[in-house]
Amino acid sequence: APVPPGEDSKDVAAPHRQPLTSSERIDKQIRYILDGISALRKETCNKSNMCESSKEALAENNLNLPKMAEKDGCFQSGFNEETCLVKIITGLLEFEVYLEYLQNRFESSEEQARAVQMSTKVLIQFLQKKAKNLDAITTPDPTTNASLLTKLQAQNQWLQDMTTHLILRSFKEFLQSSLRALRQM
């Protein structure tokens, strides 16, 4: 399911809880996606030794995965709600092609990979409702995405395993940075 079902077992709701606010719904949606990533990472780590590789060893890759930096306005120093929100939405839109790549990369967690992809689409919709300056959000070019997808799928097995690991790790990190920033809004 693209949206978490009610209160998950990890959360304790007060009796007769009010309906979730927009912020709570976004927070919960991110946590739901993080659960999905965690499950996918388990399968990836069981299949290959990528997870033991250091960050430095994996840094030499040609993937242009979105990353949060101080200039994006999401860090405490220079925090800017609107700039940050634009960065989060833009980053998630950029991740979509990589999430599409993940769709055929899992055997036992195929449904989980689809859930992460669909849940991310829902998250983007939630965030777009929250954003005031939608004009500042640049949508990735479909043609560029299509050729990137073809290129990634043409890699050898080892590189595909590496790519899968890097996407999951970077996406997790991006979501966590986003989660922290959104809680300040």
Epitope: K10, D11, V12, E24, D27, R31, L34, S38, K55, M68, E70, C74, F75, Q76, S77, R169, K172, E173, Q176, S177, L179, R180, R183, Q184
Partner: antibody
Framework: QVTLKESGPTLVKPTQTLTLTCTFS??????????VGWIRQPPGKALEWLAL???????HYSPSLKSRLTITKDTSKNQVVLTMTNMDPVDTATYYC??????????????WGQGTLVTVSS | DVVMTQSPSSVSASVGDRVTITCRAS??????LAWYQQKPGKAPNLLIY???SLRSGVPSRFSGSRSGTDFTLTITSLQPEDFATYFC?????????FGPGTKLE
């Protein structure tokens, strides 16, 4: 196993700058979801949160002390350093460093150092 | 800042008793609450996070609950090693803030 240890001067003079180092092992500050923070406790009083630094170098400070605090990390050395300027006798306290590690960023501090007592006196 | 208040500030109890400590947040903090135990001369020790999640290794006699902005730490059947000071901490908003503590004696 996770360990953290604070080091630094036990006695500082008023107006001086305090530099404390937290050296940790058993985890990496380059792992997403990890943060290391500083908390202090004046003798017989409550805990006071000072600062927190995250894996991605985002830094959060207590607003009342922000102008006096700087937190930095050295991932390769497994160290976090806190500097506090213009020390005053009211800053006399046990200073703790602690770790937070949670995928959902709930910031509960699951491992603490033993603490170091810093006395500010002339 | 989110102000955390704790009651009582101290409580006397005997081994085997059931003890309840309450913590109130000045604004909604959702489930972002942790409880710590501190013994004299020692660092605090995390007992409970996310309102009611028991940290691994913590005895099941400790439990946490929530009602709105009121949070409760309950110790059923008090043991000799439970005599200590207990602090709550909200982790929803920066700055992270602690309660003033409850001394269990």
């Amino acid at each position: 196993q996770v360990t953290l240890k604070e080091s630094g001067p036990t006695l500082v003079k008023p107006t001086q700058t305090l530099t404390l180092t937290c050296t940790f092992s058993g985890f990496s500050l380059s792992t997403s979801g990890v943060a290391v923070g500083w908390i202090r406790q004046p003798p017989g009083k409550a805990l006071e949160w000072l600062a927190l630094i995250f894996w991605d170098d985002d830094k959060h400070y207590s607003p009342s002390l922000k102008s006096r605090l700087t937190i930095t990390k050295d991932t390769s050395k497994n160290q976090v350093v806190l500097t506090m300027t213009n020390m005053d006798p009211v800053d006399t306290a046990t200073y703790y460093c602690a770790r937070s590690y949670d995928d959902y960023l709930y910031y509960a501090l699951d491992y603490w150092g033993q603490g170091t007592l810093v006395t500010v006196s002339s | 800042d989110v102000v955390m208040t704790q009651s009582p500030s101290s409580v006397s109890a005997s081994v085997g008793d059931r003890v309840t400590i309450t913590c109130r947040a000045s604004q909604d903090i959702d489930n972002f609450l942790a409880w710590y135990q501190q013994k004299p001369g020692k660092a605090p020790n995390l007992l409970i996070y996310k309102v009611s999640s028991l940290r691994s290794g913590v005895p099941s006699r400790f439990s946490g609950s929530r009602s709105g902005t009121d949070f409760t730490l309950t110790i059923t059947s008090l043991q000799p090693e439970d005599f200590a000071t207990y602090f709550c901490q909200q982790t929803r908003r920066f700055p992270l803030t602690f309660g003033p503590g409850t001394k269990l004696e």
